[in-house]
Interface confidence: low
């Protein structure tokens, strides 16, 4: 086997903030199953971060499958809380600055920044694109502003 490091580039939109999923099944790929029925269903797409239509075959598949757009949204989307920005009134680092780097369960491998409590500096890491934690910033500047002294 080759020992070369393989770079996965699935997620394309690096402008999006970290995706916080309510349920892990929202990260499952749409699965039409082995049967041949034509049933309109909805699934949550972790790349577009939207509920989208797909055709379900009528059997098997997985839990990322909803009968209505509303049900899909209810199960798989939620408002991402605004990031906590440090002000003169908030001199302490937010708790999430002390969380470990967490790429999450997906495999998008996009570049993000996290605060490394060992080195006391913001550093680059590869984020999978969903889940993870709030120690995850789109820019080095944002990370420094919130987590560095």
């Amino acid at each position: 086997d080759s020992e070369e490091d393989e770079e996965h580039t699935i997620i394309t939109d690096t402008e999006l903030p970290p995706l916080k999923l309510m349920h892990s099944f929202c990260a499952f790929k749409a699965d039409d199953g082995p049967c041949k029925a034509i049933m309109k269903r909805f699934f949550f797409n972790i790349f577009t971060r939207q509920c989208e239509e797909f055709i379900y075959g009528g059997c098997e598949g997985n839990q990322n499958r909803f009968e209505s757009l509303e049900e899909c949204k209810k199960m798989c989307t939620r408002d991402n809380a605004n990031r906590i920005i440090k002000t003169t009134l908030q001199q302490e680092k937010p708790d999430f600055c002390f969380l470990e780097e967490d790429p999450g369960i997906c495999r998008g491998y996009i570049t993000r920044y996290f605060y490394n409590n060992q080195t006391k500096q913001c550093e680059r890491f590869k984020y999978g694109g969903c889940l993870g934690n709030m120690n995850n910033f789109e820019t080095l500047e944002e990370c420094k502003n919130i987590c560095e002294d």
């Epitope: 086997d1 349920h23 590869k126």
Partner: antibody
């Protein structure tokens, strides 16, 4: 074939540190997480954390935060787990286990599919 | 943290018996559950992942089912080599956790 070969048994005194190694072969080392799991004598399995050999990123179980350090040397495809400030209740067999980088949309890959043979760490004064 | 409770803790059965072990999660974990077999002095061996997918090389007498909070491992016809301890494990959220184990003994 995939193999994870761990270092030999260790006897340590309370307060000391131990470093266990896990040498991987038969697959791309940087393509999978390496988990560490321990098992006290006659007890169940306890997950300690993982290291991403690609980035060096780690995720430790809260119970071990501050005492465990997971590192890797990609040049020799080896992961390490160091546990400090040892206590008698750290006496256990320590296993490394290969893991996928969590889900890839579908949970269709086997996680924890290969395990090392285990390293017995005995903490005794 | 998610707790997994296995039942029974121990079980005596005979070769040829059908055996079912259950694993209950303290909260929903979708299908992110695995089952392992462990024999004394050996590392655990993966049997089932994603709740119901049989790992390559594992005999078809082993099967898994369930989703959400309730899961089962079934051995359709016990063989002498199946007497061991079985563990479930959740991979839905950190910290990853294991059940306390079910020891399967010869009756």
């Amino acid at each position: 074939q995939v193999q994870l070969v761990q270092s030999g048994a260790e006897v340590k005194k309370p307060g000391a540190s131990v470093k266990v190694s896990c040498k991987a072969s038969g697959y791309t080392f940087t393509g999978y997480y390496m988990h560490w799991v321990r098992q006290a004598p006659g007890q169940g399995l306890e997950w300690m954390g993982w290291i991403n050999p690609n980035s060096g990123g780690t995720n430790y179980a809260q119970k071990f935060q501050g005492r465990v350090t997971m590192t890797r040397d990609t040049s020799i495809s080896t992961a390490y787990m160091e546990l400090s400030r040892l206590r008698s209740d750290d006496t256990a067999v320590y296993y490394c286990a290969r893991g996928i980088a969590r889900l890839q949309w579908l949970p269709t890959e086997a996680d924890f599919d290969y395990w090392g043979q285990g390293t017995l760490v005995t903490v005794s004064s | 943290a998610i707790q997994l409770t296995q039942s029974p803790s121990s079980l005596s059965a005979s070769v040829g018996d059908r055996v079912t072990i259950t694993c209950r999660a303290s909260q929903g974990i979708s299908s992110s559950l695995a089952w392992y077999q462990q024999k004394p002095g050996k590392a655990p061996k993966l049997l089932i992942y994603a709740a119901s997918t049989l790992q390559s090389g594992v005999p078809s007498r082993f099967s898994g089912s369930g989703s959400g909070t309730d899961f089962t491992l079934t051995i359709s016809s016990l063989q002498p080599e199946d007497f061991a301890t079985y563990y479930c494990q959740q991979l839905d959220s950190y910290p990853l956790s294991f059940g306390q184990g079910t020891k399967l003994e010869i009756k």
